[in-house]
Protein backbone atom coordinates (compact mmCIF):
# COMPACT_ATOMS: atom_id res chain seq x y z
CA UNK A 1 0.00 0.00 0.00
CA UNK A 2 1.25 3.47 -0.88
CA UNK A 3 1.25 5.54 2.30
CA UNK A 4 3.51 8.40 1.27
CA UNK A 5 2.59 12.00 0.57
CA UNK A 6 4.39 14.62 -1.48
CA UNK A 7 4.66 18.15 -0.18
CA UNK A 8 5.51 20.76 -2.81
CA UNK A 9 6.13 24.48 -3.00
CA UNK A 10 2.61 24.75 -4.38
CA UNK A 11 1.48 27.63 -6.58
CA UNK A 12 4.37 30.02 -7.01
CA UNK A 13 5.17 33.11 -8.99
CA UNK A 14 8.44 34.69 -10.05
CA UNK A 15 9.72 37.59 -12.08
CA UNK A 16 10.66 37.36 -15.72
CA UNK A 17 14.43 37.07 -15.98
CA UNK A 18 14.72 35.75 -12.44
CA UNK A 19 15.16 32.29 -10.94
CA UNK A 20 12.94 29.95 -8.96
CA UNK A 21 13.50 26.77 -6.99
CA UNK A 22 11.06 23.92 -7.52
CA UNK A 23 10.97 21.68 -4.44
CA UNK A 24 9.14 18.52 -3.50
CA UNK A 25 9.45 16.36 -0.42
CA UNK A 26 8.23 12.79 0.01
CA UNK A 27 7.19 11.82 3.52
CA UNK A 28 5.21 9.22 5.47
CA UNK A 29 6.80 6.26 3.71
CA UNK A 30 9.85 4.09 4.26
CA UNK A 31 10.10 3.37 0.54
CA UNK A 32 13.50 3.85 -1.06
CA UNK A 33 13.61 6.72 -3.57
CA UNK A 34 15.43 5.36 -6.61
CA UNK A 35 14.90 8.33 -8.93
CA UNK A 36 13.20 11.71 -9.16
CA UNK A 37 12.08 13.06 -12.54
CA UNK A 38 11.20 16.69 -13.18
CA UNK A 39 8.73 17.35 -15.98
CA UNK A 40 7.03 20.35 -17.51
CA UNK A 41 3.84 19.41 -19.33
CA UNK A 42 5.05 16.68 -21.71
CA UNK A 43 8.75 17.52 -21.47
CA UNK A 44 11.29 15.80 -19.26
CA UNK A 45 13.63 18.44 -17.86
CA UNK A 46 15.96 16.39 -15.68
CA UNK A 47 16.35 13.21 -13.68
CA UNK A 48 18.16 12.55 -10.44
CA UNK A 49 19.02 8.90 -9.91
CA UNK A 50 19.91 7.87 -6.36
CA UNK A 51 23.21 6.34 -7.54
CA UNK A 52 24.04 7.95 -10.87
CA UNK A 53 23.14 11.49 -9.85
CA UNK A 54 21.75 14.25 -12.04
CA UNK A 55 21.16 14.04 -15.79
CA UNK A 56 19.85 17.28 -17.32
CA UNK A 57 18.17 17.31 -20.71
CA UNK A 58 20.42 19.08 -23.23
CA UNK A 59 17.37 21.09 -24.32
CA UNK A 60 17.28 22.74 -20.90
CA UNK A 61 20.85 22.58 -19.61
CA UNK A 62 21.46 26.31 -20.12
CA UNK A 63 18.49 27.29 -17.97
CA UNK A 64 18.11 24.43 -15.47
CA UNK A 65 20.42 23.74 -12.54
CA UNK A 66 20.29 20.70 -10.27
CA UNK A 67 19.33 21.14 -6.64
CA UNK A 68 19.18 22.13 -3.96
CA UNK A 69 18.76 18.53 -2.87
CA UNK A 70 16.27 16.78 -5.13
CA UNK A 71 14.83 20.13 -6.20
CA UNK A 72 15.38 21.95 -9.47
CA UNK A 73 16.37 25.55 -10.11
CA UNK A 74 14.96 27.32 -13.17
CA UNK A 75 16.95 30.32 -14.35
CA UNK A 76 16.45 33.21 -16.80
CA UNK A 77 12.70 32.78 -16.57
CA UNK A 78 10.45 33.80 -19.44
CA UNK A 79 6.67 34.07 -19.58
CA UNK A 80 6.73 30.85 -21.63
CA UNK A 81 7.89 29.05 -18.47
CA UNK A 82 4.48 29.63 -16.92
CA UNK A 83 2.67 26.35 -16.39
CA UNK A 84 2.57 23.08 -14.51
CA UNK A 85 5.68 21.27 -13.29
CA UNK A 86 5.72 17.77 -11.88
CA UNK A 87 8.13 15.98 -9.58
CA UNK A 88 7.83 12.23 -10.08
CA UNK A 89 9.32 10.08 -7.34
CA UNK A 90 10.14 6.52 -8.39
CA UNK A 91 10.32 4.44 -5.23
CA UNK A 92 10.83 0.85 -4.19
CA UNK A 93 8.64 -0.95 -3.33
CA UNK A 94 5.80 1.61 -3.34
CA UNK A 95 5.95 2.71 -6.97
CA UNK A 96 5.44 6.24 -8.27
CA UNK A 97 4.43 9.40 -6.39
CA UNK A 98 3.71 12.63 -8.26
CA UNK A 99 3.69 16.20 -7.01
CA UNK A 100 2.42 19.24 -8.91
CA UNK A 101 3.68 22.82 -8.87
CA UNK A 102 2.14 25.68 -10.81
CA UNK A 103 4.56 28.44 -11.76
CA UNK A 104 3.46 31.84 -13.00
CA UNK A 105 6.15 34.04 -14.47
CA UNK A 106 5.19 37.69 -14.11
CA UNK A 107 6.27 40.70 -16.13
CA UNK A 108 6.00 42.90 -13.06
CA UNK A 109 8.19 42.89 -9.95
CA UNK A 110 5.26 41.78 -7.80
CA UNK A 111 5.89 38.05 -7.46
CA UNK A 112 4.88 36.31 -4.27
CA UNK A 113 5.23 32.69 -3.28
CA UNK A 114 2.05 30.72 -2.77
CA UNK A 115 1.27 28.58 0.25
CA UNK A 116 2.60 25.04 0.58
CA UNK A 117 0.14 22.25 -0.04
CA UNK A 118 0.11 18.48 -0.04
CA UNK A 119 -0.83 15.88 -2.63
CA UNK A 120 -1.59 12.44 -1.17
Amino acid sequence: MMTGTIETTGNISAEKGGSIILQCHLSSTTAQVTQVNWEQQDQLLAICNADLGWHISPSFKDRVAPGPGLGLTLQSLTVNDTGEYFCIYHTYPDGTYTGRIFLEVLESSVAEHGARFQIP
Epitope: Q35, I47, N49, H55, S57, S59
Partner: antibody
Protein backbone atom coordinates in the same frame (compact mmCIF):
# COMPACT_ATOMS: atom_id res chain seq x y z
CA UNK B 1 41.14 9.34 -22.41
CA UNK B 2 38.53 7.50 -20.33
CA UNK B 3 39.58 3.92 -19.67
CA UNK B 4 37.75 1.17 -17.80
CA UNK B 5 39.53 -2.16 -17.50
CA UNK B 6 37.71 -5.12 -15.97
CA UNK B 7 39.36 -8.20 -14.50
CA UNK B 8 38.52 -11.16 -12.26
CA UNK B 9 36.32 -13.19 -14.57
CA UNK B 10 36.77 -16.91 -15.07
CA UNK B 11 35.25 -20.35 -14.77
CA UNK B 12 33.53 -21.16 -11.49
CA UNK B 13 31.27 -23.95 -10.29
CA UNK B 14 27.63 -23.31 -9.36
CA UNK B 15 27.45 -22.01 -5.80
CA UNK B 16 30.93 -20.52 -6.08
CA UNK B 17 32.13 -16.94 -5.77
CA UNK B 18 34.08 -14.42 -7.83
CA UNK B 19 35.09 -10.80 -7.36
CA UNK B 20 35.27 -8.60 -10.42
CA UNK B 21 37.34 -5.42 -10.47
CA UNK B 22 37.28 -2.41 -12.75
CA UNK B 23 40.27 -0.07 -12.84
CA UNK B 24 39.27 3.43 -13.96
CA UNK B 25 41.49 6.15 -15.39
CA UNK B 26 41.28 9.30 -17.47
CA UNK B 27 38.54 10.95 -15.41
CA UNK B 28 37.72 11.90 -11.81
CA UNK B 29 36.41 8.52 -10.65
CA UNK B 30 35.03 9.85 -7.35
CA UNK B 31 32.68 12.21 -9.24
CA UNK B 32 30.73 9.51 -11.06
CA UNK B 33 28.16 6.92 -10.22
CA UNK B 34 29.14 3.59 -11.73
CA UNK B 35 27.38 0.44 -12.93
CA UNK B 36 27.87 -3.17 -13.86
CA UNK B 37 25.98 -4.34 -16.96
CA UNK B 38 26.03 -7.95 -18.14
CA UNK B 39 25.40 -9.69 -21.43
CA UNK B 40 24.66 -13.41 -21.48
CA UNK B 41 25.91 -15.34 -24.53
CA UNK B 42 23.86 -14.35 -27.58
CA UNK B 43 21.56 -12.26 -25.40
CA UNK B 44 20.84 -8.62 -24.67
CA UNK B 45 22.03 -6.25 -21.96
CA UNK B 46 20.97 -6.28 -18.29
CA UNK B 47 21.80 -3.63 -15.71
CA UNK B 48 23.06 -5.60 -12.71
CA UNK B 49 24.13 -3.00 -10.16
CA UNK B 50 24.72 0.71 -9.63
CA UNK B 51 26.65 2.62 -6.98
CA UNK B 52 26.76 6.29 -6.00
CA UNK B 53 29.94 8.35 -6.52
CA UNK B 54 30.60 8.33 -2.77
CA UNK B 55 29.70 4.66 -2.42
CA UNK B 56 26.96 5.46 0.08
CA UNK B 57 24.07 4.14 -2.00
CA UNK B 58 23.71 1.05 -4.16
CA UNK B 59 21.02 -0.71 -6.16
CA UNK B 60 20.93 -4.28 -7.41
CA UNK B 61 18.77 -6.01 -10.00
CA UNK B 62 16.17 -8.35 -8.48
CA UNK B 63 17.91 -11.28 -10.22
CA UNK B 64 21.07 -10.81 -8.12
CA UNK B 65 19.76 -9.33 -4.86
CA UNK B 66 21.13 -11.15 -1.83
CA UNK B 67 23.92 -12.71 -3.88
CA UNK B 68 25.88 -9.83 -5.44
CA UNK B 69 27.40 -6.74 -3.83
CA UNK B 70 28.73 -3.66 -5.62
CA UNK B 71 31.38 -1.52 -3.95
CA UNK B 72 34.13 0.94 -4.81
CA UNK B 73 37.43 2.28 -3.50
CA UNK B 74 37.79 5.88 -4.64
CA UNK B 75 41.36 6.03 -3.35
CA UNK B 76 42.24 3.25 -5.80
CA UNK B 77 39.91 4.36 -8.62
CA UNK B 78 38.45 0.87 -8.60
CA UNK B 79 34.93 -0.56 -8.82
CA UNK B 80 34.10 -4.06 -7.57
CA UNK B 81 31.38 -6.65 -7.98
CA UNK B 82 31.37 -9.44 -5.40
CA UNK B 83 29.38 -12.38 -6.76
CA UNK B 84 28.34 -15.19 -4.42
CA UNK B 85 26.08 -18.25 -4.83
CA UNK B 86 26.69 -18.14 -8.57
CA UNK B 87 24.24 -19.85 -10.91
CA UNK B 88 24.46 -21.04 -14.51
CA UNK B 89 22.27 -18.09 -15.54
CA UNK B 90 24.93 -15.67 -14.26
CA UNK B 91 27.16 -16.74 -17.13
CA UNK B 92 27.83 -13.55 -19.11
CA UNK B 93 30.28 -10.86 -20.09
CA UNK B 94 30.30 -8.24 -17.33
CA UNK B 95 30.92 -4.62 -18.28
CA UNK B 96 31.95 -1.76 -16.03
CA UNK B 97 30.16 1.44 -17.09
CA UNK B 98 30.62 5.10 -16.17
CA UNK B 99 27.79 7.43 -15.17
CA UNK B 100 24.88 7.49 -17.55
CA UNK B 101 26.43 4.75 -19.69
CA UNK B 102 28.71 7.01 -21.72
CA UNK B 103 31.84 4.84 -21.45
CA UNK B 104 32.09 1.05 -21.17
CA UNK B 105 34.99 -1.26 -20.38
CA UNK B 106 35.95 -4.13 -22.67
CA UNK B 107 34.25 -6.64 -20.36
CA UNK B 108 35.29 -9.73 -18.41
CA UNK B 109 33.76 -13.15 -18.98
CA UNK B 110 32.18 -15.13 -16.14
CA UNK B 111 31.30 -18.77 -16.83
CA UNK B 112 29.35 -20.74 -14.23
CA UNK B 113 29.47 -24.44 -15.01
CA UNK B 114 30.15 -27.76 -13.35
CA UNK C 1 9.39 -2.71 -15.22
CA UNK C 2 9.31 -0.84 -18.51
CA UNK C 3 9.74 -3.11 -21.51
CA UNK C 4 11.63 -1.80 -24.54
CA UNK C 5 10.69 -3.81 -27.62
CA UNK C 6 12.88 -3.89 -30.72
CA UNK C 7 10.58 -5.82 -33.00
CA UNK C 8 13.17 -6.41 -35.71
CA UNK C 9 15.96 -8.71 -34.52
CA UNK C 10 17.61 -8.37 -37.93
CA UNK C 11 17.52 -5.67 -40.58
CA UNK C 12 19.07 -6.02 -44.01
CA UNK C 13 20.54 -2.98 -45.72
CA UNK C 14 23.03 -1.90 -48.36
CA UNK C 15 25.84 0.63 -48.15
CA UNK C 16 24.42 4.07 -48.86
CA UNK C 17 20.88 3.15 -47.78
CA UNK C 18 18.84 5.05 -45.22
CA UNK C 19 17.72 2.75 -42.42
CA UNK C 20 15.53 3.26 -39.35
CA UNK C 21 15.77 1.01 -36.29
CA UNK C 22 12.74 1.19 -34.02
CA UNK C 23 12.11 0.63 -30.34
CA UNK C 24 8.73 0.74 -28.61
CA UNK C 25 8.41 1.49 -24.90
CA UNK C 26 5.66 -0.22 -22.88
CA UNK C 27 4.83 3.18 -21.37
CA UNK C 28 5.75 6.79 -22.01
CA UNK C 29 9.43 7.33 -21.20
CA UNK C 30 9.49 10.86 -22.64
CA UNK C 31 12.98 11.59 -24.02
CA UNK C 32 14.87 9.39 -21.53
CA UNK C 33 16.15 7.04 -24.22
CA UNK C 34 19.67 6.14 -25.31
CA UNK C 35 20.98 4.12 -28.25
CA UNK C 36 24.10 1.96 -28.30
CA UNK C 37 26.12 0.32 -31.05
CA UNK C 38 27.94 -2.96 -30.45
CA UNK C 39 30.31 -4.47 -32.97
CA UNK C 40 31.35 -8.17 -32.76
CA UNK C 41 33.78 -8.81 -29.92
CA UNK C 42 33.49 -5.25 -28.65
CA UNK C 43 31.65 -3.51 -25.83
CA UNK C 44 28.59 -1.33 -26.51
CA UNK C 45 29.26 2.30 -27.35
CA UNK C 46 26.90 5.18 -26.64
CA UNK C 47 25.56 6.80 -29.81
CA UNK C 48 22.54 8.86 -28.75
CA UNK C 49 21.21 10.06 -25.40
CA UNK C 50 18.17 12.09 -24.39
CA UNK C 51 16.47 10.62 -27.46
CA UNK C 52 18.23 12.82 -30.01
CA UNK C 53 21.59 14.10 -28.73
CA UNK C 54 24.67 12.58 -30.35
CA UNK C 55 27.49 11.47 -28.06
CA UNK C 56 30.96 12.92 -28.59
CA UNK C 57 32.50 11.81 -31.88
CA UNK C 58 29.36 10.16 -33.28
CA UNK C 59 28.94 10.92 -37.00
CA UNK C 60 25.98 13.11 -37.92
CA UNK C 61 24.51 10.38 -40.13
CA UNK C 62 23.13 8.96 -36.86
CA UNK C 63 19.99 10.67 -35.58
CA UNK C 64 17.50 9.78 -32.87
CA UNK C 65 13.84 10.73 -32.68
CA UNK C 66 10.71 10.06 -30.67
CA UNK C 67 6.98 9.90 -31.35
CA UNK C 68 5.17 9.21 -28.08
CA UNK C 69 6.29 5.68 -27.10
CA UNK C 70 8.01 4.96 -30.41
CA UNK C 71 11.73 5.69 -30.57
CA UNK C 72 13.80 5.56 -33.72
CA UNK C 73 17.49 5.51 -34.59
CA UNK C 74 18.07 6.53 -38.20
CA UNK C 75 21.26 6.12 -40.19
CA UNK C 76 20.97 8.45 -43.18
CA UNK C 77 23.56 6.70 -45.35
CA UNK C 78 24.77 3.35 -44.05
CA UNK C 79 28.52 2.76 -44.12
CA UNK C 80 30.21 -0.64 -43.94
CA UNK C 81 31.43 0.14 -40.41
CA UNK C 82 27.82 0.64 -39.25
CA UNK C 83 27.01 -3.07 -39.56
CA UNK C 84 26.55 -3.96 -35.91
CA UNK C 85 24.05 -4.63 -33.14
CA UNK C 86 21.98 -1.67 -31.93
CA UNK C 87 20.29 -1.45 -28.52
CA UNK C 88 17.86 1.08 -27.11
CA UNK C 89 17.62 1.80 -23.39
CA UNK C 90 15.21 3.74 -21.20
CA UNK C 91 16.31 5.63 -18.10
CA UNK C 92 12.94 7.21 -17.30
CA UNK C 93 12.23 4.75 -14.51
CA UNK C 94 14.23 2.29 -12.44
CA UNK C 95 15.22 -0.38 -13.16
CA UNK C 96 16.71 0.93 -16.39
CA UNK C 97 15.97 -1.53 -19.18
CA UNK C 98 17.36 -2.30 -22.62
CA UNK C 99 15.73 -3.47 -25.82
CA UNK C 100 16.61 -6.90 -27.14
CA UNK C 101 18.78 -5.52 -29.92
CA UNK C 102 18.61 -5.19 -33.70
CA UNK C 103 21.38 -6.58 -35.88
CA UNK C 104 22.07 -4.52 -38.97
CA UNK C 105 23.46 -6.72 -41.74
CA UNK C 106 24.17 -6.55 -45.46
CA UNK C 107 21.53 -7.69 -47.95
Amino acid sequence: EVQLVESGGGLVQPGGSLRLSCAASGFTFSSYGMSWVRQAPGKGLELVATIKSSGGSTNLADSVKGRFTISRDNSKNTLYLQMNSLRAEDTAVYYCVRGYFDYWGQGTTVTVSS
Amino acid sequence: DIVMTQSHKFMSTSVGDRVSITCKASQDVKTAVAWYQQKPGQSPKLLIYWSSTRHTGVPDRFTGSRSLTDHTLTISSVQAEDLALYYCQQYYSTPYTFGGGTKLELK
